[in-house]
Amino acid sequence: IFPLAFFIYVPMNEQIVIGRLDEDIILPSSFERGSEVVIHWKYQDSYKVHSYYKGSDHLESQDPRYANRTSLFYNEIQNGNASLFFRRVSLLDEGIYTCYVGTAIQVITNKVVLKVGVFLTPVMKYEKRNTNSFLICSVLSVYPRPIITWKMDNTPISENNMEETGSLDSFSINSPLNITGSNSSYECTIENSLLKQTWTGRWTMKDGLHKMQSEHVSLSCQPVNDYFSPNQDFKVTWSRMKSGTFSVLAYYLSSSQNTIINESRFSWNKELINQSDFSMNLMDLNLSDSGEYLCNISSDEYTLLTIHTVHVEPSQETASHN
């Protein structure tokens, strides 16, 4: 989905390259072709990253942190390409790289600023804590520190608690919101400004449904067009909350178009799925089916949560028998 890295051109022979943690990047450098090519890549003007001259690499003095992580485009050197292929970047690799290129004709130096970002896919969770209900937007690993915003019924909320833990190379962030007793819709946005990547979580509470025992119930789950892109891989999970924890009833993977159903009374309409409608039916209701049903549609860019509350009441027959 994302390019190897992207370049931002800035003045003075200096480029900015933005890479993602643990991915490979290219530090660009070009020169006017000539004979006797010498290429020296250095980090922060001190550490030897890669040296090439007299037709081959010379890595005897290479700083150990770059061992087995760098290479040049050897077939393209004679065409003026001195770019460095850099494997598995870490946050410690951030900084200024200087490429020295010499030929029998001239010597040039190019500077490349490497910035590294992290954005492991965030999640939106719905949790019950005693009598309180919480929505939690969280991201396990992110760098630099993201911008988190909450909206209620499309209106920004100023209250924004952020629980942050910093590790050596990234932040882990939780942003909980107490939604006890609310029927509003909520939206949480997490933005990584460096990687220009935004993730959105949306939560909607549907009106409660009252059903009689032995009946069936249809619960709707249709993605909001603003976020949903059928070309992008996503996962749909239906689950039911019992005594504070969710158990998975069924899930669907768009990549394989697989549906896995864990509850025999659960059914999905294949034709509706093909139209991106993930509404489900639960047959032959019994009293223990009362509770909250959660539809979760998730991709790399969004999570859409839809909550249904179902009340199953005894049928007249059952009541008269008792």
Partner: antibody, heavy 120, light 107 residues
């Protein structure tokens, strides 16, 4: 055009020290490796030492290893040769010379040389 | 360390003669060899690099050849201004040793 001007030569007693300097102009000094080469008057050329463009690597002839130190100040466009524990056989004209590129090639420009005489 | 030898150590030839100087490395140095000319009382001047590439401004009567351990410098037609000592130098890796030189003069 490239200009290299050596200084600091003179007469010195064995065991003493001397520091040679080489002022560079007419090219971007910090981009090029530099060498010191010496020549006993009437004899052949002897390569002495090299320093890379960024001073990250230095190499010496066996005959001077441990006694001579090559260094550079890129902000002053100057190359140095610190000569310690001088011997009679170090008597020579010392040439400062520019490498083709970073310090791993041949010499493409030479200074006029400065004479060092080690004598008791 | 690799040793460099040159032969002959000196030669006399007539103007217009073809002159050949050889340089031998004790181990292979690919084509990382340069030739210098030093006229009496002057500083050395680069003639040839990469064993056979003529430095710009050097007359075409000078040529170089060879690879590995054996190299030659040829002056196709000796001129009076070619009276000098000629040195080879290896530059495959430090130390960048010079040969002992070949002195060329005119008969």
């Amino acid at each position: 055009q490239v200009q290299l001007v050596e200084s600091g030569g003179g007469v010195v007693q064995p065991g003493r020290s001397l520091r040679l300097s080489c002022a560079a102009s007419g090219f971007t000094f910090s981009n090029y490796g530099m060498h010191w080469v010496r020549q006993v008057p009437g004899k052949g050329l002897e390569w002495v030492a090299v320093i890379w463009y960024d001073a990250s690597e230095k190499d010496y002839a066996d005959s001077v290893k441990g006694r001579f130190t090559i260094s550079r100040d890129n902000s002053k466009n100057t190359l140095y040769l610190q000569m310690n524990s001088l011997r009679v056989e170090d008597t020579a004209v010392y040439y400062c010379a520019k490498d083709l590129i970073s310090g791993i090639y041949y010499v493409d420009h030479w200074g006029q040389g400065t004479l060092v005489t080690v004598s008791s | 360390d690799i040793q460099m030898t040159q032969s002959p150590s000196s030669l006399s030839a007539s103007v217009g003669d073809r002159v050949t100087i050889t340089c031998r490395a004790s181990q292979g140095i690919s084509n990382y060899l340069a030739w210098y000319q030093q006229k009496p009382g002057k500083v050395p001047k680069l003639l040839i690099y990469a064993a056979s590439t003529l430095q710009s401004g050097v007359p075409s009567r000078f040529s170089g050849s060879g690879s590995g351990t054996d190299f030659t410098l040829t002056i196709s037609s000796l001129q009076p201004e070619d009276v000098a000592t000629y040195y080879c130098q290896k530059y495959n890796a430090a130390p960048f040793t010079f040969g002992p030189g070949t002195k060329v003069d005119i008969k």
